[in-house]
């Protein structure tokens, strides 16, 4: 008799793929544009990335450091009108893209939460949650919560409002903290909260360190759903050298949880390469004309247009990983087992029941390495085969689809491999 199929877990929409943050509408659209109507015209691009949700804004009225002149129910006229927002929501829904609204109150000011009148501010947030839920948004984000006093109790209250409206609504909290204990204390009283943090931001050093960070986090959070990013708002290039971007894309898309990216992460957008651009929100490079300030500063291979035409580009890798992440059961909700593969390497398996399984091997080092995969670390339910098919490599030159002998696996510097193999009873 065939073994019984394992019961599928309840899957919320944010479990099914990546979230894409557009914190600065003007920087995202460029050319002096930057409103909701313009963003609507970019939804096809977001669809092509196969992302499941757009984290937008903040876009509300906020006079810097002035509680009274901050209105979370009103869209700043610079970004458009409520009608523009409704129209964006409708278009996004048609493309199966969910919209999450950032309600961080004092986003133009010194302290995101004003550090004053918390009763008034919290009431404004509460009213805003109710208002925008009725308007049809799919969730909310609040950032810098390490600077909100009694954050846990407020998050619990806001979570109740959000989930009370519908279980299908999401609350994301962001913190600059990278301290696991602080992160856990924020998660403690908030069961379904998705938390973005700087926890992984110093993981770029070695495979062992990254493995240790990831496994510690997963062990500490138990079976709750995680999100994976390097910060609550900033670009990957703020933390990583260019040669590790592909490796991190592969890792973020294949860890158990929701990957969260900022606009531009898919093309390796780097503020440092664009003189005069702010680190936190450089202009998005749609094509070579997107940054006219310094002629010749932008080459085609730095842009969406250029990378779209190159199957070996970072953007093409992002699209492929996003596609895999959203359709493979083992990547959607599969079990995760990390195991030893030798110094400098981080390797793990994702598997779900009798579905196709995935092996990820990441070389963080700047020298080529032979992987010594220690299958003995793995439980019987996740055993390794002798060979696995190469689904993709972060480096060019490998023949995709070809079977690789796992005992003889060699990785180039900064190379990541995604391999697949079938379930064997």
């Amino acid at each position: 008799r065939a073994p019984r199929c394992r019961e599928l877990p309840a899957q919320k929409w944010w479990h099914t793929g990546a979230l894409y943050r557009i914190g600065d509408l003007q920087a995202f659209q460029g050319h002096g544009a930057g409103n909701l109507a313009g963003l609507k015209g970019r939804l096809d691009y977001l669809s092509s990335l196969k992302v499941k949700g757009l984290v937008l804004g903040p876009i509300h009225k906020n006079q810097k450091d002035d509680v009274a002149q901050t209105d979370l129910l009103q869209i700043d006229p610079n970004f458009g009108s409520k009608e523009d927002f409704d129209s964006l929501l409708q278009s996004a829904k048609k493309k199966s893209i969910r919209v999450i609204l950032d309600l961080t109150p004092n986003y133009r000011g010194e302290n995101s939460w004003f550090s004053t009148q918390v009763d008034t501010v919290a009431t404004k947030v509460k009213d805003a949650l109710e208002f925008w839920l009725q308007a049809g948004v799919d969730g909310f984000q609040v950032r810098d919560i390490e600077n909100l006093k009694d954050a846990s109790s407020f998050l619990a209250e806001w979570q109740n409002i959000t989930k009370g409206f519908s279980e299908d609504r999401l609350l994301i909290a962001g913190t600059n903290s990278s301290d696991l204990q602080q992160i856990l204390s924020l998660l403690e009283s908030n069961k379904d909260l998705l938390l973005t943090s700087s926890y992984l931001s110093d993981s770029g050093s070695t495979g062992e360190h990254t493995k240790s960070l990831v496994t510690q986090y997963l062990n500490a959070t138990g079976n709750r759903w995680c999100s994976w990013s390097l910060s609550q708002a900033r670009l990957l290039t703020s933390f990583l050298p260019a040669q590790l971007l592909r490796l991190y894309q592969l890792m973020l898309f294949t860890l158990p949880g929701t990957p969260v990216f900022s606009y531009g992460d898919e093309i390796g957008l780097d503020a440092a390469a664009l003189p005069g651009q702010p680190m936190e929100a450089p202009v998005m490079l749609w094509d070579e004309s997107s940054f006219p300030d310094i002629p010749g500063a932008v080459s085609a291979n730095m842009t969406v247009k250029g990378q779209s035409e190159d199957p070996g580009s970072l953007l093409s890798l992002f699209r492929r990983l996003s596609d895999q992440r959203s359709k493979e059961r083992s990547l959607l909700h599969g079990d995760f087992h990390a195991f030893s593969a030798g110094p400098g390497l981080f390797s793990y398996i994702r598997h779900w029941d009798q579905n196709e399984r995935f092996l990820v091997v990441l070389n963080f080092g700047d020298v080529g390495l032979s992987a010594g995969l220690q299958a003995s670390d793995l439980p019987a339910s996740a055993s390794l085969p002798a060979k696995a098919d190469l689904l993709l490599s972060t480096q060019p030159g490998r023949e995709e689809g070809s079977p690789l002998e796992l005992e003889r696996l060699k990785l180039e510097p900064h190379e990541g491999l995604l391999l697949r193999f079938p379930y064997a009873a």
């Epitope: 302290n111 009148q117 918390v118 509460k126 600077n147 006093k149």
Partner: antibody, heavy 117, light 107 residues
Framework: EVKLEESGGGLVQPGGSMILSCVAS????????MNWVRQSPEKGLEWVAE??????????HYAESVKGRFTISRDDSKSTVYLQMNNLRAEDTGIYYC????????WGQGTLVTVSA | DIQMTQSSSYLSVSLGNRVTITCKAS??????LAWFQQKPGNAPRLLIS???ILETGVPSRFSGSGSGKDYTLSITSLQTEDVATYYC?????????FGGGTKLEIK
């Protein structure tokens, strides 16, 4: 115009009880955290207690020195905050102010509590 | 509990001069700091909250600065009506605590 008016102070013997009231007007009382703060020449300004909103389940916090003896409560329908003080001690003597918000953007003029035999 | 320390109990400053009053917290308070002014016989009056945010109606000669554990109240040009006692208060975590106060006098 925001107004806070305390009442209920006076002379009380050690071990005795007293209830202070603070009536508020000129703002949405039910949306405001309310505090009691006291002042004495010996201890200066000393925060006593805070009460939050209905949506926070009327959460309360107290200074260590009054925990178990003082109780803060509110009646949103009357825009009034109370401080029930039991087992009073000489060191509880001072002017008691109620204040609105976090921090106290508005204060009443205070009511004097004297604990003496 | 977080202790708040105002280093000067008394300050004597000439009219028109700049005044700086400092306040140190025993732990990080993430800018959840207020400055109050109190004149004899009156209740305290909030001048600054959130370490830097000037309350409506407070003269622009008053300003607040600082972050982490160290905070400062400045008066650019001392006026007669500024004679008072100034208190800092942290309201980041309960129990909220006040500094001991700095009494400002005209030299």
């Amino acid at each position: 115009e925001v107004k806070l008016e305390e009442s209920g102070g006076g002379l009380v013997q050690p071990g005795g009880s007293m209830i202070l009231s603070c009536v508020a007007s000129g703002f949405t009382f039910s949306n405001s955290w309310m505090n009691w703060v006291r002042q004495s020449p010996e201890k200066g300004l000393e925060w006593v207690a805070e009460i939050r909103l209905r949506s926070n389940n009327y959460a309360t916090h107290y200074a260590e020195s009054v925990k178990g003896r003082f109780t803060i409560s509110r009646d949103d329908s009357k825009s009034t905050v109370y401080l029930q003080m039991n087992n009073l001690r000489a060191e509880d003597t001072g002017i008691y102010y109620c204040s609105r918000g976090d921090p106290g953007a508005y204060w009443g003029q205070g009511t004097l509590v004297t604990v003496s035999a | 509990d977080i202790q708040m320390t105002q280093s000067s109990s008394y300050l004597s400053v000439s009219l028109g001069n700049r005044v700086t009053i400092t306040c140190k917290a025993s732990d990080h308070i993430k800018n959840w700091l207020a400055w109050f002014q109190q004149k004899p016989g009156n209740a305290p009056r909030l001048l600054i909250s959130g370490a830097t945010i000037l309350e409506t109606g407070v003269p622009s000669r008053f300003s607040g600065s600082g972050s982490g554990k160290d905070y400062t109240l400045s008066i650019t040009s001392l006026q007669t009506e500024d004679v008072a006692t100034y208190y800092c208060q942290q309201y980041w975590s309960t129990p909220y605590t006040f500094g001991g106060g700095t009494k400002l006098e005209i030299k």
